[in-house]
């Protein structure tokens, strides 16, 4: 559905007449080269047509850029977010160049007023890097811009600009009203940079859609689904900050774009994975678990560079704080008989026990229903490494320990009241590792006792084959 | 307010080439794409190209790659197109349009037609 | 490429009637279509653009609506002067591609 209001000005208004912002003394586009990762430490600003600043504060030209581009701001300061990303950045990179990009003035209008901004600090950004590339050694090869919200399609409007090509954009969470379903060339696009990889983190089919749906880059991730995030629900945030408010829960989900990448910049011995997929329903059957074909990749800073013809989504699940990582098991469910079902479907619990520890007990999301004589997909996610798996228990939830099912039974006993009991048929359970690619077949403890019914549980252990690799290819950074 | 004038008819000769300008007044000029639309009698639009003209970065129709140049003047705020190896087949309107939410504004049209 | 179909050639309608064009994407461009309007001898207009937003002075009478493969722009209360072929096209990917068109007639 349309975004409550649609892009506003003309292209007449545009550039060509400055606001009185743009003719103030100081420049509503700033570029703070910071030479610390001290958010106290004033840094270096750098213009163009002056070198001495680039000489005076060691500007690598070899090395790696990274441009900080924040978005619309309601408080005209910059926020936390972006020294963390800052000193992450340095920490990673230690020879690289950070700069900031400061649009404050800019970006603390109405939003509208904001989003007509973008174009312009864009031009700027641009203007920056045609002169850098003036210099001996600067290429734009190593130029990685980093916009977030509103500040993803500034970085858009650079590498859209620039006389050449940026080596990458990374949007994070890119600003969704005004933009969704924009041309090309108005907001962030793949023919922006070399890569282009974007995070979405708070998606709304309906009502207001804070961040971008539309895929917008060679690769699009949406942690959670792209919705809603772990440790950013209401109780969650009303539990941590004193008069938690929805503005923080928006911002917590909207803001969690930067957290994910900072994260993979200071926990790169923890790398998310995720994994390629139509939609998020289809992820959340545990359907799209592969690593064949580029089908999945390292998110945020360690994303391997993809250039395929069509827009890859990904999904994957993260914890509710850093490190984000979780490791995403498939399991597959063949159901080969089931006796008086009614209307009712099953409640499933599976426990995951492993050489290096076991899960907690985990909910078996039935995203449409249990099919019988058909093998029924899921998708669970763990925490913790739990190694190599050795059994699961898989529990089937009594009705009693639901209010909801146990109205359902209820009704279901209204109509059918001789409905006897109910029971399912499970010999064997396959699962895939994500993390590792790595298929296991587990068999029932008692071949005699395949049966399940509410209230009860069924063990599972690993089948005489073992582990089998099918000639998967596992993700592409080598797991701790 | 935005305007684009569009070079006048054409006549060519078989093989030959032809360049076509596009005049832009009322923005400005380097910061927006210009594209080229092919129109032959009583077909559709058929995008051809487009030029970004501050940086001079093109993107075309695979169709067209070896068929149209673009090039453009910001000195004089003018856009052109060049049509090379003229066949019967590149008779048509040729449309150049400013880009902004979509084709925000277009050029008059001009006409070239090939023949012997 | 994206294929951009519109199904009809041809729609015949009168004057205060309301009539509906639609167009189908080959692939999901989601809301990014852009709808024109070319009277006989004129270049096109644009009248809509990320698949429901009209565009400057645009009469209201023009709407359009749609998202993933399939958008509908309709006319409210046709006019003499609506008498035109009208085009959608995708503004999700490069190459740009427009439907075939459909020309709007008046009884």
């Known amino acids: 559905s349309p975004v409550p209001f649609g892009p506003e000005g003309r292209l007449e208004d545009k550039l060509h007449k400055p606001k009185a912002t743009q003719t103030e003394v100081k420049p509503s586009v700033r570029f703070n080269l910071r030479t610390s990762k001290d958010p106290e430490h004033e840094g270096c600003y750098l213009s163009v047509g002056h070198s001495q600043p680039l000489e005076d504060c060691s500007f690598n030209m070899t090395a790696k850029t990274f441009f900080i581009i924040h978005g619309w701001t309601m408080s005209g300061i910059f926020e936390n977010w972006l020294h963390k990303l800052v000193s992450a950045l340095h920490t990673r990179e230690k020879d690289a160049n950070v700069v900031v990009v400061d649009w404050l003035p800019l970006a603390h209008q109405l939003y509208t007023d904001a989003v007509n901004n973008t174009r312009v600090v864009g031009h700027s950004i641009a203007r920056m890097l045609d002169w850098l590339q003036e210099k001996d050694d600067f290429s734009l090869g190593n130029v990685h811009l980093i916009g977030y919200s509103l500040g993803a399609h500034v970085a858009g409007y650079a590498g859209n600009f620039v006389k050449g090509t940026v080596g990458r954009i990374t949007g994070l969470d890119p600003a969704g009203p005004m933009f969704e379903g924009a041309d090309i060339h108005k907001r962030l696009s793949p023919d922006d940079a070399d890569f282009v990889d974007v995070l979405h983190t708070y998606t709304r089919s309906f009502g207001l859609s804070i961040g971008i749906q539309m895929p917008v880059g060679h690769i699009d991730i949406y942690p959670n689904g792209g919705d809603f995030q772990p440790g950013c629900g209401l109780n969650d945030v009303l539990g941590s900050i004193a008069y938690g408010t929805i503005t923080e829960v928006v911002k917590c989900e909207h803001e969690r774009a930067v957290h994910l990448f900072v994260d993979s910049l200071v926990n790169q011995d923890k790398p998310s994975f995720a994994f390629q997929c139509t939609d998020s329903n289809r992820f959340k059957k545990g359907i799209c678990l592969s690593c064949r074909k580029n089908r999945c990749n390292s998110i945020g800073y360690n994303a391997k560079k993809m250039r395929n013809k069509r827009n890859s989504k990904m999904y994957l699940k993260t914890r509710a704080g850093m490190p984000f990582r979780v490791y995403h098991y498939q399991m597959k469910i063949h159901v080969f008989s089931y006796k008086n079902m009614g209307e009712i479907e099953p409640t499933f619990y599976v426990t995951l026990y492993g050489t290096n520890a076991d899960s907690q007990t985990l909910p078996l999301e039935i995203v449409e229903r249990i099919e019988q004589n058909a093998t029924n997909t899921f998708l669970v996610y763990t925490e913790e490494d739990l190694g190599d798996l050795l059994k699961i228990q898989l529990t089937w939830e009594g009705a009693s320990q639901s209010w909801y099912n146990l109205w359902k039974e209820f009704r279901s006993y209204l109509s059918q009241p001789r409905n006897p009991g109910r029971e399912l048929n499970i010999r064997r359970i396959r699962v895939k590792s994500g993390e590792t690619q790595r298929k296991l077949t587990f068999c029932t403890e008692d071949p005699e006792n395949t049966s399940i019914s509410p209230g009860r549980e069924l063990w599972f252990r690993k089948c005489r084959d073992g582990w089998r690799m099918k000639n998967e290819t596992s993700p592409t950074v080598e797991l701790p | 307010q935005v305007q684009l004038q569009q070079s006048g008819a054409e006549l060519m000769k078989p093989g030959a080439s032809v360049k076509i300008s596009c005049k832009a007044t009322?923005?400005?000029?380097?910061?927006?794409?210009i594209a080229w639309v092919k129109q032959r009698p009583g077909h559709g639009l058929e995008w051809i190209g487009e030029?970004?003209?501050?940086?001079?970065?093109?993107k075309y129709n695979k169709k067209f790659k070896g068929k149209a140049t673009f090039t453009a003047d910001t000195s004089s705020n003018t856009a052109y197109m060049q049509l090379s190896s003229l066949t019967s087949e590149d008779s048509a309107v040729y449309y150049c349009?400013?880009?902004?939410?979509?084709?925000?504004?277009w050029g008059q049209g001009t006409s070239v037609t090939v023949s012997s | 490429d994206i294929v951009m179909t519109q199904s009809h050639k041809f729609m015949s309608t009168s004057v205060g009637d309301r009539v509906s064009i639609t167009c189908k994407a080959s692939?999901?461009?989601?809301?990014?279509v852009a709808w024109y309007q070319q009277k006989p001898g004129q270049s096109p207009k644009l009248l809509i653009y990320?698949?429901?937003y009209r565009f400057t002075g645009v009469p209201d009478r023009f709407t359009g609506s749609g998202a993933g493969t399939e958008f509908t722009f309709t006319i409210n209360s046709v006019q003499a002067e609506d008498l035109a072929v009208y085009y959608c096209?995708?503004?999700?990917?490069?190459?740009?591609?427009f439907g075939g068109g459909t020309k709007l007639e008046i009884k």
């Open positions: 349009a400013v880009y902004d939410y979509g084709a925000d504004y």
């Open positions: 009322g923005y400005t000029f380097s910061t927006y794409w």
């Open positions: 030029i970004l003209p501050g940086s001079a970065k093109t």
């Open positions: 692939q999901d461009v989601y809301t990014a």
């Open positions: 990320s698949a429901s």
């Open positions: 096209q995708q503004h999700y990917s490069i190459p740009r591609t």
